[in-house]
């Protein structure tokens, strides 16, 4: 008795696909050992056709796959485009050789069944329309025409030329003739349902002189397309239901026992379990649409169906497309925090993983919006203009080679609460969803900047100080100048670091930045922050206004962000001449060319501020003393 289990007999027809699941005992060795599918020869030798080690035989090239699901203790062999030559005896098994643990499987592939010469076979999918052609001789041109359905020996009339229609075909069947044709009539049956399948007889005339035609109607439920996705990755259901339903509401549902529960539709319905991680996007005017789901969970596995109906709900007799989604728990996508919490006025640093093999890919961060079918406008990217409303408080820090980038958002408000997506223009599976929860602050922020009213005078020296608590003592403190292409670290001076680590005076932990001499282009947002290596922590922002020496009137700050800081002792700091030049860069217009659900940040030229000299940001890390 083999501990491996699977189907003993598999029967299919030419052109079809099979998906064979083999079950193995749940042990660590079994989960990780080689899985194989081999064909038993007459000589007793079993020739490997496909294995989990990556081997694929020539005869299976382009039509087979083997996928291991260690969390279920199963592996699945998919074989497409079957021919009668595939008929034979096979083994699915485990082990380094094909003599290990195995299960015998018999596969039989038959020809598509043929019908008698006078029977026309019509094969249609559920929800579609069939047009049955009925030929007759001229002698029956003026006789009654009818279509009946065989039920045992009887043939029950579906429709006839006297305008009779069987109630179960009401509004679905029509009998008509085309143009001046005198030898053929047609019957259309629309919104096909499984029970419509069967043998039909069309007839012109009565008695022995009647002309009869046989029609075999096969109504197929769509065979589900098998989708294998990793945990935490994303899946796109591409739905093409045809032009006839182009103007009807579209939906994606998930099969649940007898029903199919709508996950999302174009009428605004959305399952709360998919909140923040689903988008429905119309593809064209012919009814094509796609549904993208990110952050796949184990419980997302199952049977899905897309369809169209004016109600936005599944309806019998309307076209559908089907998938079976498998979610593999052995994922290459690292586990990252799905909920990030912040407080008003504070900041969050969100770590976004990406495929480490694609370190040069463009990184983006978008805000999922629930309106309509869901959308995700890009807020910031490695080459994307920071969206309006986020200037001075949002930056993306790429860490090439680390397999992650960090997005920092500060000056938080409760309106920032919601879902955000990390994505790249590379591997589309690496999309992560983060829920940001912003609560009202109950205490003053950890980082405070003085002076609060930061107005610098051209030609003079200007120092701003950032006060930090003792808990940040061991972390690296930095100042950076915010621009559309990030926040460039500036040389700064850490006063607190001079003290002994034993006695930390809460009031004198300060990191300062000096502009000397102040230039007009020094105006803008500056951030004070803490980090440990590549791990970014808390930040705070201040807007530094720059005015002419002669002007007496104080500069009005563009936001009230600076008002948060309390007065605190200023102090001397290392001088640095901070300069930034402008250069221009364009957002790659090809980004998501085929995935329009993620809105581009715009293809307009933007100003990315970069370094012009050593005193500025360009590639320079902060120097703290």
């Amino acid at each position: 008795q083999s501990p491996i289990f699977g189907p003993q007999d598999v029967s299919s027809i030419e052109g079809n696909s099979v998906s064979i699941t083999c079950y193995y005992p749940d042990t660590s060795v079994n989960r990780h050992t080689r899985k194989y599918w081999c064909r038993q020869g007459a000589n007793g030798y079993c020739a490997t056709l496909i294995s989990s080690n990556g081997y694929l035989s020539k005869e299976y090239s382009g039509r087979a796959s083997l996928i291991n699901f260690p969390e279920n203790s199963t592996f699945v062999i998919n074989i497409a485009h079957l021919t009668q030559e595939d008929t034979g005896s096979y083994k699915c098994g485990l082990g380094t050789t094909n003599r290990g643990l195995f299960f015998d499987v018999s596969l039989e592939v038959s020809q598509v069944p043929e019908f008698p010469n006078d029977t026309h076979v019509y094969t249609k999918d559920i929800g579609r329309t069939v047009t049955i052609e009925c030929r007759f001789k001229e002698g029956n041109a003026h006789s009654k025409k009818s279509l009946c359905k065989k039920r045992g020996e009887a043939c029950e009339v579906v429709i006839d030329s006297t305008e009779y229609v069987d109630p179960s075909y009401k509004d679905r069947a029509i009998l008509f003739m085309k143009g001046t044709s005198r030898d053929i009539f047609y019957v259309n049956i629309s919104h096909l349902i499984p029970s419509d399948a069967g043998l039909y007889v069309c007839q012109a005339g009565e008695g022995p002189s009647a002309d009869k035609n046989n029609a075999d109607l096969q109504v197929l439920e769509p065979e589900p397309e098998l989708l294998y996705k990793d945990l935490r990755s994303s899946v796109t259901f591409e739905c093409d239901l045809g032009r006839e339903v182009a103007n009807d509401a579209k939906y994606l549902c998930r099969k649940n026992k007898e029903t199919c529960d709508v996950i999302i539709n174009t009428l605004g319905k959305r399952d709360p379990a998919f909140e923040g991680r689903i988008l429905l996007t119309p593809r064209d005017d012919n009814g094509r649409f796609s549904v993208l789901i990110t952050g796949l969970r184990k419980e997302d596995a199952g049977h899905y169906q897309c369809g169209a109906h004016s109600s936005g709900l599944p309806q019998e007799g309307w076209p559908v497309q089907a998938w079976q989604l498998f979610v593999n728990e052995e994922s290459t996508i690292p586990n990252s925090r799905s909920v990030v919490k912040g407080v008003t006025g504070g900041s969050v640093a969100i770590v976004c993983p990406y495929n480490p093999k694609e370190s040069s890919s463009l990184k983006y961060w978008c805000h999922w919006e629930a309106d309509e079918n869901g959308r995700c406008p890009v807020l910031v990217g490695t080459q994307a203009l920071v969206q309006e409303g986020y200037e001075g408080r949002l930056a993306l820090f790429d860490q090439p080679g680390s397999g992650a980038y960090t997005v920092i958002l500060n000056q938080l408000t409760t309106q920032d609460s919601g879902f955000y997506w990390c994505l790249t223009d590379g591997d589309s599976r690496w999309r992560t969803t983060i829920e940001l929860q912003v609560a009202e602050a109950t205490k003053k922020p950890d980082l405070e900047v003085t002076p609060q009213n930061a107005t610098a005078v051209i030609g003079e020296t200007f120092t701003i100080s950032c006060h930090y608590p003792c808990k940040f003592y061991s972390q690296e403190k930095y100042w950076c100048k915010w621009s559309n292409d990030g926040c460039h670290i500036l040389p700064s001076h850490d006063e607190g670091a001079r003290q002994s680590s034993v006695s930390c005076d809460q009031s004198s932990q300060i990191v300062s930045m000096t502009l000397n001499p102040v230039k007009k282009e020094d105006e803008g947002w500056y951030w004070c922050g803490v980090k440990e290596g590549q791990v970014y922590g808390e930040t705070t922002a201040i807007y530094v206004a720059v005015e002419e020496r002669t002007r007496g009137s104080p500069h009005i700050n563009p936001t009230d962000a600076n008002a948060r800081a309390k007065d605190a002792p200023e102090e001397e700091a290392m001088e640095s001449s901070v300069r930034e030049d402008e250069n221009k860069a364009n957002l790659d217009p090809r980004l998501f060319a085929d995935e329009r659900e993620i809105q581009n940040a715009g293809d307009q030229a933007q100003e990315n501020r970069a370094s012009g000299n050593a005193g500025s940001a360009g590639g320079q890390s902060g120097s703290s003393k």
Epitope: N16, T74, E223, P224, K257, E258
Partner: nanobody
Amino acid sequence: EVQLVESGGGLVQPGGSLRLSCVASGLPGSSSRMAWFAQAPGKEREFVAAIAWRGRTSYKYYSDSVKGRFTVSGDNAKRTLDLQMKDLNPEDTALYFCAAHPNDDGDPRISGNYQYWGQGTQVTVSS
């Protein structure tokens, strides 16, 4: 409402044959799985055989104890399931239940992977 009705049970001598039938009415979907389970007095329900349909492909599963003796067959369109039992022995005595599920998810041997059940038909093998 889904209903499963079994028939064909009875008393048979060791070495004899029997054919069980099951009709499922109202089972949704075109892909489905139907199975036979046996429950001997004082024992748990045990998997006997199953057939799964996905489109125009069928998959037949058997327990080790009936392999080569029992043959499962059925018609997905008619939602019927048959079990041809040959070379019966007293250990095969049990109440045989027909089970059905609207799709082919999960291990077919596990009774929890079936949503619908019949009332059972008694098979007694005795001389």
